[in-house]
Amino acid sequence: SERCDDWGLDTMRQIQVFEDEPARIKCPLFEHFLKFNYSTAHSAGLTLIWYWTRQDRDLEEPINFRLPENRISKEKDVLWFRPTLLNDTGNYTCMLRNTTYCSKVAFPLEVVQKDSCFNSPMKLPVHKLYIEYGIQRITCPNVDGYFPSSVKPTITWYMGCYKIQNFNNVIPEGMNLSFLIALISNNGNYTCVVTYPENGRTFHLTRTLTVKVVGSPKNAVPPVIHSPNDHVVYEKEPGEELLIPCTVYFSFLMDSRNEVWWTIDGKKPDDITIDVTINESISHSRTEDETRTQILSIKKVTSEDLKRSYVCHARSAKGEVAKAAKVKQKVPAPRYTVELACGFGAT
């Protein structure tokens, strides 16, 4: 057949769906690869064709749209499963073509099993809530388009294995779950189960997300340099190892990039000739505040190195700070036999 623009296997869109639940999967061509939508393509006489490759097989085969109760169907640019089965797992391809044009993309679909507490290999989206910040809500995700607005589904919310009822600060409100005041104890996995009727059958949609309670913007401060500080003097003799830790606390800030760096005499360590190594470690608090430690190390320090200016810098979306380390050369202790004896007039 004629050449087809093949976008390959789009592994960025690893689609996971639960077994025995409806799934609607849009052809990724129109969302991520082509500059026109399905309606335009259809009006121009292009046809959307679906086929698939079963798990652990190489053979591409057409999708069977003649299954009982239309278990698999296509509607515009959407492939429907009502419901999925475990052996629907595989790579699916949607191809848009006419006699002169062809474009296709494949994507993996994984049908996963869940247990009675909604545990599964499903990758969960994370929703961050600010601690002690007033009312915040999460919404049951990815349920649009499954039923018309005239259908009123029932929605049940769970935290872990427990149905949410009479929780002191968490209130189910239909598709939304409201947190009156988010606390660390609200961390966990939340599941909404949406039940709706369709053509005399009842379907369930299960959606789980992870709630992570993070530091509030009310508590956010510019970076705080705990070390170096004015209380510690790094006093060394030439030839000794110089180790200076720079320890910086960063408040959690959504989408902030936290940076720590050293300068030596105003230059980045990479831009100077002395043999400096810098090791970084990072720890996170329960609310995702961050402590970064960068240890500046000079294995064998020279008297010249001990005269340099060592400054630790830190930057976040809240501001930039810097602190110089107090470095000095240790005055050698007097050698009694020579220096003190000389003081007594001995030669």
Partner: antibody
Framework: QVQLVESGGGLVQPGGSLRLSCAAS?????????MCWVRQAPGKGLELVAC???????TWSASWAKGRFTISKTNSTTLYLQMNSLRAEDTAVYFC????????????WGQGTLVTVSS | DIQMTQSPSSLSASVGDRVTITCQAS??????LAWYQQKPGQAPKLLIY???TLASGVPSRFSGSGSGTDFTLTISSLQPEDFATYYC??????????FGQGTKVVIK
């Protein structure tokens, strides 16, 4: 009324076992509380023993407690500490406490139960 | 493991005195420090969390300050009911959950 009540303490011989209980009232474990056992030897300070998230069941134990002390919970409102191979130095008041992972308005302690390990 | 070092281990003071207790962490814990008061035969009572936030019902003569590794609990004017043992607690993350060894405040 929101409270914690410990029980199960008493006299036990070295090498023996004991199971402490902590009954929660006024709340249940369906919310993800961080429930801990903290001990205090006579005339000494507070020492964290083990903790559990009540919803997920994830646990944490002090390094010295691993292998001898096990924290667990029932589905609803009871926390346990199973203590095996007890030693004289385990003699202490054992407190049950809530939300030590972010002590704030929800922080709560029981009155404690005394465990004496002696022959 | 983190070490929390309180000083002094005990202090004697009179009613009306200003009292300061310090707590030093062996590694940076940001603002994640709580202070508790414990009286003989009783459970600890939360006084301050997040280094400086007063727990509900705690008198304003208690205050906390500090961040990183160095923290202070101050009682601005000691009252008869304040004679007790005070503990600091780190809760930055599960690797840093620990109590200080305590500071006993006794009547001079």
């Amino acid at each position: 009324q929101v409270q914690l009540v410990e029980s199960g303490g008493g006299l036990v011989q070295p090498g023996g076992s004991l199971r402490l209980s902590c009954a929660a009232s006024g709340f249940d474990f369906s919310s993800n509380y961080y429930m801990c056992w903290v001990r205090q030897a006579p005339g000494k300070g507070l020492e964290l023993v083990a903790c559990i998230y009540t919803n997920s069941g994830n646990t944490w134990s002090a390094s010295w407690a691993k292998g001898r002390f096990t924290i667990s919970k029932t589905n609803s409102t009871t926390l346990y500490l199973q203590m095996n191979s007890l030693r004289a130095e385990d003699t202490a008041v054992y407190f049950c406490a809530r939300d030590l992972n972010y002590p704030d308005t929800s922080n709560l302690w029981g009155q404690g139960t005394l465990v004496t390990v002696s022959s | 493991d983190i070490q929390m070092t309180q000083s002094p281990s005990s202090l004697s003071a009179s009613v009306g005195d200003r009292v300061t207790i310090t707590c030093q962490a062996s590694q940076s814990i940001g603002y994640y420090l709580a202070w508790y008061q414990q009286k003989p035969g009783q459970a600890p009572k939360l006084l301050i969390y997040r280094a400086s936030t007063l727990a509900s019902g705690v008198p304003s003569r208690f205050s906390g300050s500090g961040s990183g590794t160095d923290f202070t609990l101050t009682i601005s004017s000691l009252q008869p009911e304040d004679f007790a043992t005070y503990y600091c607690q780190s809760y930055y993350n599960s690797d840093s959950d620990a109590f200080g060894q305590g500071t006993k405040v006794v009547i001079k």
